[in-house]
């Protein structure tokens, strides 16, 4: 379907990290504007970003209502200054996005090591439980609240004096690892959802090393 002098949007792409979700598309508009609609499989479409000249639309507020649903967005093109105009089929020109299931597809944001504490030859490493924009009972949920045991963290750790890495895994946000007494260690963590087929892993967190301010050390 089409409207004279308008170009259909193309390259509709979901950009989503920790459920913050933006739909992007092309082209930059010339004498046209866009409106976005989003729907679950019910086909009850909700309009967002009305008559915009942007080529992105923040759909976070819609997808966080149920992150396990599958969503589709469509971008309508209208002639600038004549948004009532429709195509020969009685509808404005539109293009569909790919399907998007936030729970299965949102990228896992880069995690942060919140703290580490050494007690003798044990070190407890804690990963920050990042807040998402998903709400329950008017409270923002953390990544762990949303994913539960589907989310694990992998810890990479190594002696500051060597390059050989060891790994540990946890389905909480804490690790308890054995270390050699008197050695300084460096740590990096990665969020992983093993059950996923796409976007399974986050990027690695910034490296934190013992002897720097994040840690607490108690020799026993």
């Amino acid at each position: 379907s089409g409207t004279t002098n308008t170009v259909a949007a193309y390259n509709l792409t979901w950009k989503s990290t920790n459920f913050k979700t933006i739909l992007e598309w092309e082209p930059k508009p010339v004498n046209q504007v866009y409106t976005v609609q989003i729907s679950t499989k019910s086909g009850d479409w909700k309009s967002k970003c009305f008559y915009t000249t942007d080529t992105e639309c923040d759909l976070t507020d819609e997808i966080v209502k149920d992150v396990k649903q599958t969503y589709l967005a469509r971008v309508f093109s209208y002639p600038a200054g004549n948004v009532e105009s429709t195509g020969s089929a009685g509808e404005p020109l539109y293009e569909n996005s790919p399907e998007f299931t936030p729970y299965l597809e949102t990228n896992l944001g880069q995690p942060t090591i919140q703290s580490f504490e050494q007690v003798g030859t044990k070190v407890n490493v804690t990963v920050e439980d990042e807040r998402t924009l998903v709400r329950r009972n008017n409270t923002f949920l953390s990544l762990r609240d949303v994913f539960g045991k589907d989310l694990i963290y992998t810890l990479y750790y190594w002696k500051s004096s060597s390059s050989g890495k060891k790994t540990a895994k946890t389905n909480t946000n804490e690790f308890l690892i054995d270390v050699d007494k008197g050695e300084n260690y460096c740590f990096s963590v990665q969020a992983v959802i093993p059950s996923r087929t796409v976007n399974r892993k986050s990027t690695d967190s910034p490296v934190e090393c013992m002897g720097q301010e994040k840690g607490e050390f108690r020799e026993i």
């Epitope: 379907s1 499989k41 019910s42 086909g43 020969s88 089929a89 009685g90 293009e95 569909n96």
Partner: antibody
Framework: EVQLLESGGGLVQPGGSLRLSCAAS????????MSWVRQAPGKGLEWVSV????????YYADSVKGRFTISRDNSKNTLYLQMNSLRAEDTAVYYC???????????WGQGTLVTVSS | EIVLTQSPGTLSLSPGERATLSCRAS???????LAWYQQKPGQAPRLLIY???SRATGIPDRFSGSGSGTDFTLTISRLEPEDFAVYYC?????????FGQGTKVEIK
């Protein structure tokens, strides 16, 4: 397992009315668009109407607009098609279909035959 | 409304051969607003492909869809005995939704 079971078909005279029903099970009914598609004997498929999950949006083929009304009762997991002012050319097998986004039809019932004849 | 024209009307092939079915729209239906269905005698249609190229649940990978805009293709890489049937394309780029007239794939 998704199941769609149509009923209400039969023989009706031109100008008469008929109400088709489609009982759905095996999925969350209110979460999906639903549609009616028909097929005249020996002919191809013809889309008739579609309704969104909430019932708030409906579309019709030009050939039935003003005569047919699609509706749904989400509490009963049932889809309906009220057919008025029936014509001989409405004779067909009527299929109920699950319609994600009101776009395409991923599960179909086995159909119910509507015959309009004097 | 958008008119879909399928070709050929009938395709006579042997099991094991490749089948290529065409669906052409009278105007653009967008890059991906097309579905393909299979129907056997006395049965309801079955969804094969949606979004022009995405296989529906449980559909064997010998079925593939391609195309965009006005020209779409359904390919069956190696015909199995159970694939002989009528195939319909359907667009959802605008309302009313419309079907092609069908292509019959018959045993040669």
């Amino acid at each position: 397992e998704v199941q769609l079971l149509e009923s209400g078909g039969g023989l009706v005279q031109p100008g008469g009315s008929l109400r088709l029903s489609c009982a759905a099970s095996g999925f969350t009914f209110s979460s999906y668009g639903m549609s009616w598609v028909r097929q005249a004997p020996g002919k191809g498929l013809e889309w008739v109407s579609v309704i969104s999950g909430s019932g708030g949006t409906t579309y019709y083929a030009d050939s039935v607009k003003g005569r047919f009304t699609i509706s749904r009762d989400n509490s009963k997991n049932t889809l309906y098609l009220q057919m008025n002012s029936l014509r001989a050319e409405d004779t067909a097998v009527y299929y109920c279909a699950k319609a994600p986004w009101t776009y395409y039809f991923d599960y179909w019932g086995q159909g119910t035959l509507v015959t309009v004849s004097s | 409304e958008i008119v879909l024209t399928q070709s050929p009307g009938t395709l006579s092939l042997s099991p094991g051969e490749r089948a290529t079915l065409s669906c052409r729209a009278s105007q653009s239906v967008g890059s991906s607003s097309l579905a393909w269905y299979q129907q056997k005698p006395g049965q309801a249609p079955r969804l094969l492909i949606y979004g022009a190229s995405s296989r529906a649940t449980g559909i064997p990978d010998r079925f593939s869809g391609s195309g965009s805009g006005t020209d779409f293709t359904l390919t069956i890489s190696r015909l199995e005995p159970e694939d002989f049937a009528v195939y319909y394309c359907q667009q959802y780029g605008s309302s009313p939704r419309t079907f092609g007239q069908g292509t019959k794939v018959e045993i040669k």
